[in-house]
Amino acid sequence: SEVEYRAEVGQNAYLPCFYTPAAPGNLVPVCWGKGACPVFECGNVVLRTDERDVNYWTSRYWLNGDFRKGDVSLTIENVTLADSGIYCCRIQIPGIMNDEKFNLKLVIKPAKVTPAPTRQRDFTAAFPRMLTTRGHGPAETQTLGSLPDINLTQISTLANELRDSRLANDLRDSGATIRIG
């Protein structure tokens, strides 16, 4: 089943997807599409990368993270109810049927009317972000995307980066878990 992420109307939505590039000069192409991942490619492509750059995008969609280091998480700006649905992150690993595919469900809630100002979350993931090595744990925990052949040092580094990132407060609030194996 797809992992669910939530955002309010007017916020930026964040859909996580990660992989580990083999070499800096040789990134794996990635596509993001609206709708579940088909057998090949992405349907209704909203953004695409090649061996170096974002080479196709539509307005309101961008990769805010360091995609050249494998953070291909998608940001959708100023979401509306129409942005609800399944999104596909596809890591296009060379070779026949080698692609890693991840379906993420985005649920858009109507904006809350609050009487007093509160801390506004720039983007929210309703569920904890969990990290697993490939082939371990139930499918619904694999919300950070593909991390082929990742080692414990990389896991620890990524955990530190997550802790230190501008998402730190939100991740703490949601009880972010780093799960290994």
Epitope: D53, W57, W62, L63, N64
Partner: antibody, heavy 114, light 108 residues
Framework: QIQLQQSGPELVTPGTSVKISCKAS????????INWVKQRPGQGLEWIGW????????KYNEKFKGKATLTVDTSSSIAYMHLSSLTSEDSAVYFC???????WGQGTTLTVSS | QIVLTQSPAIMSASPGEKVTLTCSAS???????LYWYQQKPGSSPKLWIY???NLASGVPARFSGSGSGTSYSLTISNMETEDAASYFC?????????FGGGTKLEIK
């Protein structure tokens, strides 16, 4: 230390072509991209394209396709940019820049004049 | 392509004054690949701020950078005479890479 050393100024006539060089030192040439950037007098900067010396792969800004050709000589760690069918619009300073735009050559001034 | 619009195009500031230069992108860009350069006449651009907010080597601490998505800025907390130069923002996440038109910062 990392350095990018460009060839000297060029004065050429319209319709001809020119080849500008950028010699890299202080790092493994084949491991990092080289970018090329154009700057017309008193104006902004325009990215021309990149080349990855390790594979020879190139990418061009659509605006410079057919105008610029990027090549490398890995044995001498030199990147080249060939500019063809020159017009006065091509008069500019051309820079090579490192993989992450953190190192820049000193610039090569190209003047196209009859 | 992503258009980067810098404002103001030209500005003057007195020594000690706080200065903010802005860079607006036509579409969101990765904050990891939003850079600022300083350029003085007759010189190559120098990397000044990388990945939105990190100062390049040798850049004085009075400089800072911030922003995300489509809106970025460079701030000088206390203008000094040596800061008079042109400043360019640059994105190199989306191809073709693009530069802002620059802000020429003059000393009053």
């Amino acid at each position: 230390q990392i350095q990018l050393q460009q060839s000297g100024p060029e004065l050429v006539t319209p319709g001809t072509s020119v080849k500008i060089s950028c010699k890299a030192s202080g790092y493994t040439f084949t491991d990092y991209y080289i970018n090329w950037v154009k700057q017309r007098p008193g104006q902004g900067l325009e990215w021309i394209g990149w080349i990855y010396p390790g594979s020879g792969n190139t990418k061009y800004n659509e605006k410079f396709k057919g105008k610029a050709t990027l090549t490398v000589d890995t044995s001498s760690s030199i990147a080249y940019m060939h500019l063809s069918s020159l017009t006065s619009e091509d008069s500019a300073v051309y820079f090579c820049a490192g993989d992450r735009f953190d190192y820049w050559g000193q610039g090569t001034t190209l003047t196209v004049s009859s | 392509q992503i258009v980067l619009t810098q404002s103001p195009a030209i500005m003057s500031a007195s020594p000690g004054e706080k200065v903010t230069l802005t860079c607006s992108a036509s579409s969101g860009v990765s904050s990891s690949y939003l850079y600022w350069y300083q350029q003085k006449p007759g010189s190559s651009p120098k990397l000044w701020i990388y990945s939105t907010s990190n100062l390049a080597s040798g850049v004085p601490a009075r400089f800072s950078g911030s922003g995300s998505g489509t809106s970025y800025s460079l701030t000088i907390s206390n203008m000094e005479t040596e800061d008079a130069a042109s400043y360019f923002c640059h994105q190199w996440s989306n191809s073709p890479y693009t530069f802002g038109g620059g802000t020429k910062l003059e000393i009053k």
